[in-house]
Interface confidence: low
Amino acid sequence: DVERTTCPPEKEVHEIDESLIFYKKRELEACVDAALLAAQMDRVDAIPFTYEQLDVLKHKLDELYPQGYPESVIRHLGHLFLKMSPEDIRKWNVTSLETLKALLKVSKGHEMSAQVATLIDRVVVGRGQLDKDTVDTLTAFCPGCLCSLSPERLSSVPPSVIGAVRPQDLDTCGPRQLDVLYPKARLAFQNMSGSEYFVKIRPFLGGAPTEDVKALSQQNVSMDLATFMKLRREAVLPLTVAEVQKLLGPHVEGLKVEEQHSPVRDWILKQRQDDLDTLGLGLQGGIPNGYLILDLSVREALS
């Protein structure tokens, strides 16, 4: 915390301007009125304050707004945003996309992922849902930021907005996030023809259930191996050799390359070796001929 002192009369501040860069930290603390600072926040970013001086200004705003800054201040934070912690941002109520854009621009090139994720979360809460304008802003100014949102927040995305999401926006999404987004994408693209549908749904398939993957195998989609490898393990395991062959089409040869990787490895272990041999790829590790497969989980459930 900054030491409290009395402001010397000659240092009294009547407006926020460049003269303040010469003030020592304790002079800024003593001489800058927090209400004046808040009213003239739009000037702060044009003044080359040191990070230590920005700490003082932040401290003053924190004292003035202990429950969180108003959006009129947030909008003009500029590089002062770099001083904000996720805990600070969690107190904010942000509804303006102009505010979001301004702060996303400031954060570029700085390690601010935690702060940006919290900011986006506050915008979604403030706006009531993850609407198309918000998604468009995120994809334009913060590619990949969509994945910083929790599954709960992503559940507020209307299916109509899904079309604005690009494949690269989903690169860092986890399984639980794709589980939320996939059904929305399926709904959003349901009226498209087979090949067009597959191109659109492909980035979301990490959230697809077995029955949908099986359905795709009947549509000659020729799924690439990279997409296949991102499918849920649970979605892949029940597929038959014939279904995987149909699903991958000419890309089926890639299974040999991925033979030791999940989900391919786990899938191989579930197939009869006879069936795997029909692919002619030399895949090994299937259930040997003549072996009986007992589903012990049924017995365990009964005992």
Partner: nanobody, 117 residues
């Protein structure tokens, strides 16, 4: 198949820093999202940080603001800068491709990070 070799671990005091590196072989490295994972004794392996092919990053709550993931596609390397380390960060750290959906059985040896109090 991409081969991954992690390095840079070691013993460090709480509050200290380490920089982990993960060197990858394979010409398609730059097109893969990459992830750093860790596994503490008796615990499940967890995703710590992810970086997309374009450089977008994502972090677990427990490391946000302390860890930074980055990549150098020219060197086929992904890094994890770990600052303000805590004893609870002690684990074996691994990197892998196709994050956060990761092959179960194609992990490297990992690199041990031990943070003493």
């Amino acid at each position: 198949e991409v081969q991954l070799v992690e390095s840079g671990g070691g013993l460090v005091q709480a509050g200290g820093s380490l920089r982990l590196s993960c060197a990858a072989s394979g010409s398609t490295f730059s097109s893969y999202p990459m992830g750093w994972y860790r596994q503490a004794p008796g615990k499940q392996r967890e995703l710590v940080a992810a970086i997309s092919s374009g450089g977008s990053t994502n972090y677990a709550d427990s490391v946000k603001g302390r860890f930074t993931i980055s990549r150098d596609n020219a060197k086929n390397t992904v890094y994890l800068q770990m600052n303000s380390l805590k004893p609870e960060d002690t684990a074996v750290y691994y990197c892998n491709t196709r994050s956060p959906r990761v092959p179960n059985d194609s992990w490297g040896q990992g690199t041990q990070v031990t943070v003493s109090s």
